[in-house]
């Protein structure tokens, strides 16, 4: 049996029992790999004399797709596995009606976790076996009996990598904005020493509590639009690879020379971090290589110091700070937490204290985007090929899937009342929740116009009663007349216009006796032809950037860089007097018609470009014959 | 009425990187999701990349999915889109797009809005 670990206690904590709000009463029906633990799930709970409603969502970024866990199998031999498929259990999200809230929990055996309301930071466990229903500890971090831990990373280690510290360079931002640069992602791959796996008992817990521990510190750091995935676990269950000692210093040059050994054959990663159940001399918790990150030196080591794993997760969140540049917020003038000063302190405080941070310094932010300048932190730019665990759609990512209604973002950032964004289903009530014939969720009345006529080749739209999409756009009949030239497909191509449009507003048709002949390769004039639907010529304008011309006389045509293809005059351009370059050849208009479509609409409509009837308004295809309401009464009217 | 501006298109050796960005103009920006799009030679428009009006959702689709990072600056006014370790079927005239958050559902015809388009050339 494994030695019990020698947890810290509660102080103060409340009991709650948590209750799980019923999810979307459509059920999809998903294939039975998912597993147990939902995409989304909510949960009420009552404390502090508040009732909180947790809104999570499961963290599906949490492990990249190349993902693996090494341990030493019963025959003494090094095991490296790639779990496949694995349904998982650990969640984030926010609490609702809390703007700046967060949150970051398991619901593998009960919920544990944090969730965070303005400088509050509430941590939850289970206090039995009892699931996620059963009896919960909600208690402050500050109410955990611990002693305080500090970094053992000093100020002197610090100066030279960071340079001078001022004021100055620290403007505050408002707390609520991400910084406008793109997601940047660290690939972490985490070492658990012998005595952590002692401490825990098994590779299970072992794997279970790390999870949860990166959970925590991708959360932390989602503030500073970066993410953390875990691409590798290493288990040392059955004895150290290398000395794990309790001067924190010392241990993290034996696990960066380590790492250098194993670098070719394990993951590529950006940062490595030790978690030991080795208690560190003193009150340091941990030690990290400053600015390191990226390089061969990226890493840290942490002593799981505390009963709940956000504990170690603040620990490690702050020696990956000093990875990524941060200095100690202490030791920069007039640096500021955001934070109440009876919550505690930043991230990047020198010690713990109390109570567990919850957020970075304005000048941890700073410290960030200065290190993002290095040409060193290139590896934080490639997303690593995330894994999607579960499989399918993925509700609240801005993309309509499989099963869905509707996805306007997850509950915090959807605007859209129509749609249930927990559920990407219709709100209840509503007809539909998208589209230019949807109004206040329900569906526009037949008639109605949505798109209005842009130009003279095109045809006006009306919504049809029983969709909220617009019908597609049609245009006029190919072959109307329009200024210059006849409607093909919505536009009007004249040669006039296609030189404007390559050569700008000064650009026009070249002479007619420059189409009289095609063009070889090499700018060279040969067979004569008899029309104007061979290569473009023009002349005027400004020669188009990029772009090689081949000149013949006063005749500009313009021709690929190799000199092979010339641009031609384009489909539909009109050639003479109801006649347009079809084919490559200057035809008759009536290649456009196989028949008189307009007689067919019945006095409602007229043809369009797909020779079919484009009805009135009120009027129903495909031949105009009856109005909209007399189908939608015999069909029934739901949209 | 919002009007979208792309820019950053040019041409580039597979593998390399460009970003694009796309300024708009004409309306509150942070109410408006973004989407970048494409369309190569000869291929069907396809989506690329989407993010809501705050910036705290982004997702870019299946086929650029670690390569292309799309982000957004509103005191600027400006989407951007981040292409590395491009390839020559990444060749395509990318255009931003705009759809209003009030209204959006996730589909493609939420996207009103449309720019004229960058030209994006990868060689091999």
């Known amino acids: 049996i494994a030695p019990s670990r020698p947890w810290a206690l509660m102080e103060q904590y409340e009991v709650v029992l948590p209750w799980r709000l019923p999810g979307p009463r459509v059920r999809r029906a998903l294939p039975s790999h998912l597993g147990l633990h939902p995409e989304r799930v909510s949960y009420v709970l009552g404390a502090t004399g508040h009732n909180f409603t947790l809104h999570l969502r499961k963290n599906r970024d949490l492990l990249g797709s190349g993902y693996t866990e090494t341990y030493t199998a019963a025959n003494g031999s090094e095991v490296t596995e790639q779990p496949r498929g694995q349904d998982h259990c650990f969640y984030q999200g926010h609490v609702e009606g809390y703007p700046d809230s967060a949150a970051s929990l398991s619901t593998c055996a009960g919920l544990r976790g944090f969730f965070q309301v303005g400088s509050d930071l509430h941590l939850i466990e289970p206090l039995d076996e009892g699931g996620e229903g059963g009896r919960h500890a909600v208690y402050q971090a500050e109410h955990l009996l611990q002693t305080a831990g500090t970094c053992g990373v000093s100020d002197d280690s610090l100066g030279s990598l960071l340079g001078p510290r001022t004021a100055a360079v620290f403007r505050p931002r408002p707390g609520d904005s991400l910084p406008s640069r793109e997601t940047r992602y660290v690939e972490l791959y985490v070492v658990v020493d012998n005595a952590e796996f002692q401490m825990l008992g098994s590779e299970a817990a072992v794997r279970h509590r790390v999870l949860e521990v990166v959970n925590h510190v991708d959360k932390l750091y989602q503030k500073l639009n970066f993410r953390v995935v875990l691409v590798g676990l290493e288990i040392w269950n059955s004895q150290d690879r290398f000395h794990v000692s309790p001067d924190p210093s010392v241990t993290l040059e034996n696990l960066l020379t380590w790492q250098a050994r194993q670098r070719t054959r394990r993951h590529l990663h950006d940062n490595v971090q030790l978690i030991t159940g080795v208690d560190f001399t003193g009150t340091t918790v941990g030690f990290a290589r400053v600015s390191a990150m990226c390089s061969h030196s990226s890493g840290a080591v942490n002593q799981d110091h505390s009963k709940n794993p956000v504990g170690v997760a603040c620990t490690m969140a702050h020696e990956m700070g000093h990875n990524l540049g941060m200095d100690h917020d202490e030791n920069v003038q007039g640096c500021r937490c955001q934070e109440r000063f009876e919550a505690g302190r930043c991230i990047m405080a020198g010690s713990i204290g109390s109570s567990f941070p919850r957020m970075f310094s304005d000048c941890s932010q700073a410290y960030l985007e200065s290190f993002l300048e290095r040409p060193q932190s290139v590896c934080l730019a490639n997303a690593p090929d995330l894994s999607h665990l579960v499989g399918g759609p993925v509700c609240g990512n801005l993309f309509v899937e499989r099963g869905e209604q509707c996805d306007c973002g997850p509950p915090e950032d959807c605007r859209n009342r129509c749609c249930n964004s927990t559920t990407c289903q219709l709100a209840e009530g509503a007809q539909c929740a998208h589209g230019t014939c949807c109004q206040e969720c329900k569906v526009k009345p037949a008639g109605e116009l949505c798109r209005p006529k842009k130009d003279m080749c095109d045809l006006e739209e009306f919504c049809d009663g029983r969709h909220p999409e617009c019908p597609e756009d049609a245009f006029q009949e190919n072959g109307t007349p329009c200024s210059g030239g006849y409607c093909y497909n919505g536009a009007c191509p004249t040669l006039a216009q296609q030189c404007q449009a390559f050569w700008g507003p000064g650009g026009q048709a070249a002479e007619e006796s420059c189409f009289s002949y095609d063009i070889l390769p090499g700018c060279k004039a040969s067979r004569y032809r008899a029309d104007m639907c061979g290569v473009l010529q023009c002349k005027g304008g400004q020669q188009p950037l990029g772009r090689a011309i081949c000149i013949v006389d006063v005749c500009h045509a313009l021709t690929t860089e190799d000199g092979t293809a010339y641009e031609p005059v384009p489909e539909g351009t009109r050639c003479g007097p109801e006649k347009v370059c079809w084919k490559g050849r200057c035809q008759d208009l009536h290649v456009y018609r196989s028949s008189n479509c307009s007689a067919q609409c019945h006095n409602h409509g007229v043809c369009n470009h797909k020779q079919e009837c484009h009805c009135h308004a009120g009027w129903a295809p495909p031949h105009c014959a009856k109005l909209l309401t007399e189908v939608h009464a015999a069909s029934g009217s739901l949209p | 009425e919002v009007q979208l501006v792309e820019s950053g298109g040019g041409r580039v050796q597979a593998g390399g990187s460009l970003r694009l960005s796309c300024e708009a103009s004409?309306?509150?920006?942070?109410?408006?999701?973004i989407g970048w799009f494409r369309q190569g030679p000869g291929k069907e428009r396809e989506s690329v990349a989407r993010?809501?009006?705050?910036?705290?959702?982004?997702t870019t689709t299946e086929t650029v999915k670690g390569r292309f990072t799309i982000s957004r600056d509103n005191a600027k006014n400006t989407v951007y889109l981040q292409m590395n370790s491009l390839k020559p079927e990444d060749t395509a005239v990318y255009y931003c797009?705009?759809?209003?958050?009030?209204?959006?559902?996730?589909?493609?015809?939420?996207?009103?809005?449309w720019g004229q388009g960058t030209q994006v050339t990868v060689s091999s």
């Open positions: 797009a705009a759809a209003y958050s009030g209204h959006f559902s996730g589909r493609v015809s939420d996207f009103l809005y």
């Open positions: 004409g309306r509150t920006f942070s109410d408006y999701i």
């Open positions: 993010i809501s009006g705050s910036g705290l959702t982004n």
